[in-house]
């Protein structure tokens, strides 16, 4: 879903069943620790020397919903995610580096603790480099492992 040119950002939430108040996980992994803002996430990544994984999604996007279920139910993904600073966003930040090829959802971007956006860690779709589908969960796992190999190791 490309939320810059399509209706994703204007979804009418009345079409969805009422949900209980959600934690910061928004269903992406209730046992994980999630940050609230991009600024907080960057600070935690830098100070903890852990890479940051940012998931851009929308509640009213079928592909966000589908990826979320697979992500949350995959034990390997959930275990590996413990080694990241985690942030999921249902809005766009002002940082253009987080949308190198557009503001579509779902997309997953990795940021190194050196605060370098890992634009080199991509999915399999040439027209949406940071998109993942449920069938891409093994690739996402591989990419998480790549992101854990930091660009610059602090001494």
């Amino acid at each position: 879903k490309d939320i810059t040119v399509k209706s994703g950002a204007k979804k009418d939430t009345k079409d969805s069943a009422p949900k209980l108040p959600q934690t910061l996980s928004r269903g992406w992994g209730d046992q994980l620790i999630w940050t609230q803002t991009y600024e907080e996430a960057l600070y935690k990544s830098k100070t903890s020397n852990k890479p940051l994984m940012i998931i851009h999604h929308l509640d009213e996007c079928p592909h966000s919903q589908a990826l979320k279920k697979v992500f949350a139910e995959n034990k390997e993904i959930q275990k590996l995610a413990e080694q990241f600073v985690l942030l999921n966003l249902v809005y766009e930040t002002t940082d253009k580096h987080l949308s190198p090829d557009g503001q579509y959802v779902p997309r997953i971007i990795f940021v190194d603790p050196s605060l370098t956006v890992r634009a080199d860690i991509t999915g399999r779709y040439s027209n949406r480099l940071y998109a993942y589908e449920p069938s891409d969960i093994a690739l996402l796992l591989d990419n998480m492992k790549k992101a854990l190999k930091l660009l610059k190791t602090e001494l």
């Epitope: 209706s7 079409d15 996007c61």
Partner: antibody, heavy 120, light 107 residues
């Protein structure tokens, strides 16, 4: 192999309710989206909504939001479509259709359909 | 909601001929389009998903192409059992929507 077996035809009066079932087998029930689609006599297909049996999350077509309820029972690997305050225009064949095997949204397998007739 | 327009409404062809069915979306749907075949009194059968991926068990004479707004289902050489109604479906955004269908009939 994957099977979706729906309940039998129903004849109901206007204002009544009906609950159509779709019993599944041959795959991990809780990990595939289940869609419901309807087809009025001689007409095309309309998407009603979907449910994720793992946690009961749903999303409805706004047109069907008020009187249509999707539910799932993991203990018997069955999803349900309940329609209340039935109207003559609800007369249709109702299909359940499973999402992709990997959790993707596309519709892969279909039930045989359940005819619901609403008539006084 | 996204509107899918199928054309032609009816296609009259003979067995062995090539069938080309069109489905146009009212906005960009990436490649999130499926094709279904339906015969009278039966449930639809899924042929293609993600615009061009053939479902297991579907004969190779069926193929799908396109992305964005324009999509095509091609049946390379019609078999007698292929005469039916064909529907496209977009699952890019809610609500999912179907095209109005194309009836492929024997000429």
């Amino acid at each position: 192999q994957v099977q979706l077996v729906q309940s039998g035809s129903e004849l109901k009066k206007p204002g009544a309710s009906v609950k159509v079932s779709c019993k599944t087998s041959g795959y991990v029930f809780s990990r595939s989206w289940m869609n419901w689609v309807r087809q009025a006599p001689g007409q095309g297909l309309e998407w009603i909504g979907w449910i994720y049996p793992g946690d009961g999350d749903t999303n409805y077509n706004g047109k069907f939001k008020d009187r249509f309820v999707l539910s799932a029972d993991k203990s018997v690997s069955t999803v349900y479509l309940q329609i209340s305050s039935l109207k003559a225009e609800d007369t249709a064949v109702y299909f359940c259709a499973r999402g992709g095997y990997d959790g993707s949204p596309w519709l892969s397998y279909w039930g045989q359909g359940t005819l619901v007739t609403v008539s006084s | 909601e996204i509107v899918l327009t199928q054309s032609p409404a009816t296609l009259s062809l003979s067995p062995g001929e090539r069938a080309t069915l069109s489905c146009k979306a009212s906005q960009d749907i990436n490649s999130y389009l499926s094709w279904f075949q339906q015969k009278p009194g039966q449930a639809p059968r899924t042929l293609i998903y993600r615009a061009n991926r053939l479902v297991d068990g579907i004969p190779a004479r069926f193929s799908g192409s396109g992305s964005g707004q324009d999509f095509t289902l091609t049946i390379s050489s019609l078999e007698p059992e292929d005469f039916a109604v064909y529907y496209c479906l977009q699952y890019d955004e809610f609500p999912f929507t179907f095209g109005g269908g194309t009836k492929v009939e024997i000429k």
